[in-house]
């Protein structure tokens, strides 16, 4: 499955939109930094079959979409930017879903992939727990926004590596 060129442009647009969503000075939030334990090893792309990588990417985008689709998120961010960001993520999900269906027919995805997907889910659980503990404060959202920008960058890099393998 070849992800369309528009997919990588969508990635870039999503990152730009997320960068624009900041509402307060990040400098006031330094003390709120937190270790969310991003599962980097799931995004290095070396030990994966293509089908596995695509399903992990899908989970990453799906969880990001869910996080920014909550009522608390709507209250935190400027609405038009949030809607554009969600639209970009939704389009990426569609692209990846088409690929997942195609690739799973080609390769039998081993159980190891379930561990990778679980690692991504647990990562987002930690993010949600942090937001809850911080009572969804503006600084907590800023820290999460920075974290998601970082994790989406990892996703983008994995997608680039997948395209090079094609």
């Amino acid at each position: 499955c070849d992800l369309p060129q528009t997919h990588s442009l969508g990635n870039r647009r999503a990152l730009i939109l997320l960068a624009q969503m900041g509402r307060i000075s990040h400098f006031s939030c330094l003390k709120d930094r937190h270790d969310f334990g991003f599962p980097e090893e799931e995004f290095d792309g070396h030990q994966f079959q293509k089908a596995q990588a695509i399903s992990v990417l899908h989970e990453m985008i799906q969880q990001t979409f869910n996080l920014f689709s909550t009522e608390d998120s709507s209250a935190a961010w400027e609405q038009s930017l949030l809607e554009k960001f969600s639209t970009e993520l939704y389009q990426q999900l569609n692209d990846l879903e088409a690929c997942v269906i195609q690739e799973v027919g080609v390769e039998e995805t081993p159980l190891m992939n379930e561990d990778s997907i679980l690692a991504v889910r647990k990562y987002f659980q930690r993010i949600t727990l942090y937001l809850t503990e911080k009572k969804y404060s503006p600084c907590a959202w800023e820290v999460v926004r920075a974290e998601i920008m970082r994790s989406l960058s990892f996703s983008t890099n994995l997608q680039k590596r997948l395209r090079r393998k094609d």
Partner: antibody, heavy 121, light 107 residues
Framework: EVQLVQSGAEVKKPGESLKISCKGS????????IGWVRQMPGKGLEWMGI????????AYSPSFQGQVTISADKSISTAYLQWSSLKASDTAMYYC??????????????WGQGTLVTVSS | DIQMTQSPSSLSASVGDRVTITCRAS??????LNWYQQKPGKAPKLLIY???SLQSGVPSRFSGSGSGTDFTLTISSLQPEDFATYYC?????????FGQGTKVEIK
């Protein structure tokens, strides 16, 4: 390979203006903040201020607020430190360093080689 | 501002010695504490971040410990290349502040 390359040594007279630079390469320049640190001859390290190149937001140490200006041009991955009117007491080595911002990652993990500024009449 | 106080300000030691440098913050900084090494004419180099995490490429003889207000940098077996000045720095809040430095000299 991540690198921060600073502009060369400067010799200036009191009252003159100066702008020194720090060019980042080998990483996404807008994903990290750039901090500036002063080291006067034979002395310790003093944090001056920081910039987020993605939006040019800045924060200064109270000791340096109003004394210097920090700026950045993300199109050329370069941060700047400038003085409008130098004093003899500005004579020092100035370092730029990369900061991960709000991400949980090492602070000031890469440093420039330093720019020696000498102010003398 | 958070004040950082290092001790001692200088020490003399021999190759192979175990060296300990302490850093005290004027208020709790949890684990937002970094250690740097600086050699004459060179830029500082990050050794330890978040109080106890060893920076990539730094020899394992360097270790950091502590939380709250009291922190320690330990060099388990001093090597010739370790003679330098060491700085602690808090990264909890702005303004970021450094300790005054500890110079490790050859005995």
């Amino acid at each position: 390979e991540v690198q921060l390359v600073q502009s060369g040594a400067e010799v200036k007279k009191p009252g003159e203006s100066l702008k020194i630079s720090c060019k980042g390469s080998g990483y996404s320049f807008t994903s990290y903040w750039i901090g500036w640190v002063r080291q006067m001859p034979g002395k310790g390290l003093e944090w001056m201020g920081i910039i987020d190149p993605s939006d040019s937001d800045t924060a200064y140490s109270p000791s340096f607020q109003g004394q210097v200006t920090i700026s950045a041009d993300k199109s050329i991955s370069t941060a700047y430190l400038q003085w409008s009117s130098l004093k003899a007491s500005d004579t020092a080595m100035y370092y730029c360093a990369r900061h991960p911002g709000l991400n949980w990652a090492p602070d000031f993990d890469y440093w420039g080689q330093g720019t020696l500024v000498t102010v003398s009449s | 501002d958070i004040q950082m106080t290092q001790s001692p300000s200088s020490l003399s030691a021999s190759v192979g010695d175990r060296v300990t440098i302490t850093c005290r913050a004027s208020q709790s900084i949890t684990n937002f504490l970094n250690w740097y090494q600086q050699k004459p004419g060179k830029a500082p180099k990050l050794l330890i971040y978040f109080a106890s995490s060893l920076q990539s490429g730094v020899p394992s003889r360097f270790s950091g410990s502590g939380s709250g207000t009291d922190f320690t940098l330990t060099i388990s077996s001093l090597q010739p290349e370790d003679f330098a000045t060491y700085y602690c720095q808090q990264s909890l809040d702005f303004p970021l502040t450094f300790g005054q430095g500890t110079k490790v000299e050859i005995k």
